[in-house]
Amino acid sequence: LNTTVLQGMAGQSLRVSCTYDALKHWGRRKAWCRQLGEEGPCQRVVSTHGVWLLAFLKKRNGSTVIADDTLAGTVTITLKNLQAGDAGLYQCQSLRGREAEVLQKVLVEVLEDPLDDQDAGDLWVPEESSSFEGAQVEHSTSRNQETSFPPTS
């Protein structure tokens, strides 16, 4: 499973959309978690509504919001007021009982707001986004950038 790389500016919002096979994942809740290390468990940040039919309702934990469009097969996570400490590796998951299937791995990069940094030239964003093989890199500097990931096979 490839890791998707998303960039957001500190203080702004980053929206992540993970798509999945709506039939295969029928009836399953979705979750967003932080991967603190390869060996350790993925630490749950937020999950969709406990009643699957109400999964379209937004669920919030702190500054992270999740909502699931179960018909379209798209779960959307919004990281509001992005902080430096939010940078890291995350997963979109589909929950089945106590088991969790990884829908997408997401590496979140938080960039300094140039307006907060008088020497903004010191923050370097490469022109070539594909400098890391196997990683999709998307620059998100708008307040509501939405990125859709293709369904995983």
Epitope: Q7, Q83, E128
Partner: antibody, heavy 115, light 107 residues
Framework: QVQLQESGPGLVKPSETLSLTCTVS????????WSWIRQPAGKGLEWIGL???????IYNPSVKRRVTMSVDTSKNQFSLKLTSVTAADTAVYYC?????????WGQGTLVTVSS | EIVLTQSPATLSLSPGERATLSCRAS??????LAWYQQRPGQAPRLLIS???NRATGIPARFSGSESGTDFTLTISSLEPEDFAVYYC?????????FGQGTKVEIK
């Protein structure tokens, strides 16, 4: 098991450029972030900066006008360059994987700034 | 930048005793705090992440807690290999910063 190994000159002259490379083995460099941290003898730890998967960098303001970090994915390496060094830059330099926290470290390399 | 102040600077204890190390942040770090152990001549090792989560392979005698901007590392019963320097580190805001360290030495 991920392993990190720092390499580079152990002695650098004042006003010259310190250059170090960190080689990552046992895993791909491309799915994580990577930091440099230094420790003067008998003192505490100072974070120098990090390089993201995309190649974007965040530097500590204390050194940001003198520091450059880069990555070479084909060699599974990332590097540090620190210009205009002085005796105050003498320290053990560590590279580390920055996955929310520094979970893997190199063993460190001592760099002495002296003429 | 966020300043982390560790206390005491040195803690003199005997094996089997309980060690309590403190780290105070100059502002909120939202639980984004870690503890590291550094033995002489070695690189630091991650013990605790997110203020209270033990890292993989770390013995249960190590535990972390928080109360606002005050963080505590507790070693319930010191083993000979636990005598080392301990650092706290925040990654709530750039630049990532470390405390100045607490040395746990044999009494």
């Amino acid at each position: 098991q991920v392993q990190l190994q720092e390499s580079g000159p152990g002695l650098v002259k004042p006003s010259e450029t310190l250059s170090l490379t960190c080689t990552v083995s046992g895993g791909s460099i491309s799915s994580y972030y990577w930091s440099w941290i230094r420790q003067p003898a008998g003192k505490g730890l100072e974070w120098i900066g990090l390089i993201y998967t995309s190649g974007s960098t965040i530097y500590n303001p204390s050194v940001k006008r003198r520091v450059t970090m880069s990555v070479d994915t084909s060699k599974n390496q990332f590097s540090l360059k620190l210009t205009s060094v002085t005796a105050a830059d003498t320290a053990v330099y560590y590279c580390a994987r920055d996955l929310f926290y520094f979970d893997y470290w190199g063993q460190g390399t001592l760099v002495t700034v002296s003429s | 930048e966020i300043v982390l102040t560790q206390s005491p600077a040195t803690l003199s204890l005997s094996p089997g005793e309980r060690a309590t190390l403190s780290c105070r942040a100059s502002q909120s770090v939202s639980s984004y705090l870690a503890w590291y152990q550094q033995r002489p001549g070695q690189a630091p090792r991650l013990l605790i992440s997110d203020a209270s989560n033990r890292a993989t392979g770390i013995p249960a005698r190590f535990s972390g807690s928080e109360s606002g901007t005050d963080f505590t590392l507790t070693i319930s019963s010191l083993e000979p290999e636990d005598f080392a320097v301990y650092y706290c580190q925040q990654r709530s805001n750039w630049p990532w910063t470390f405390g100045q360290g607490t040395k746990v030495e044999i009494k």
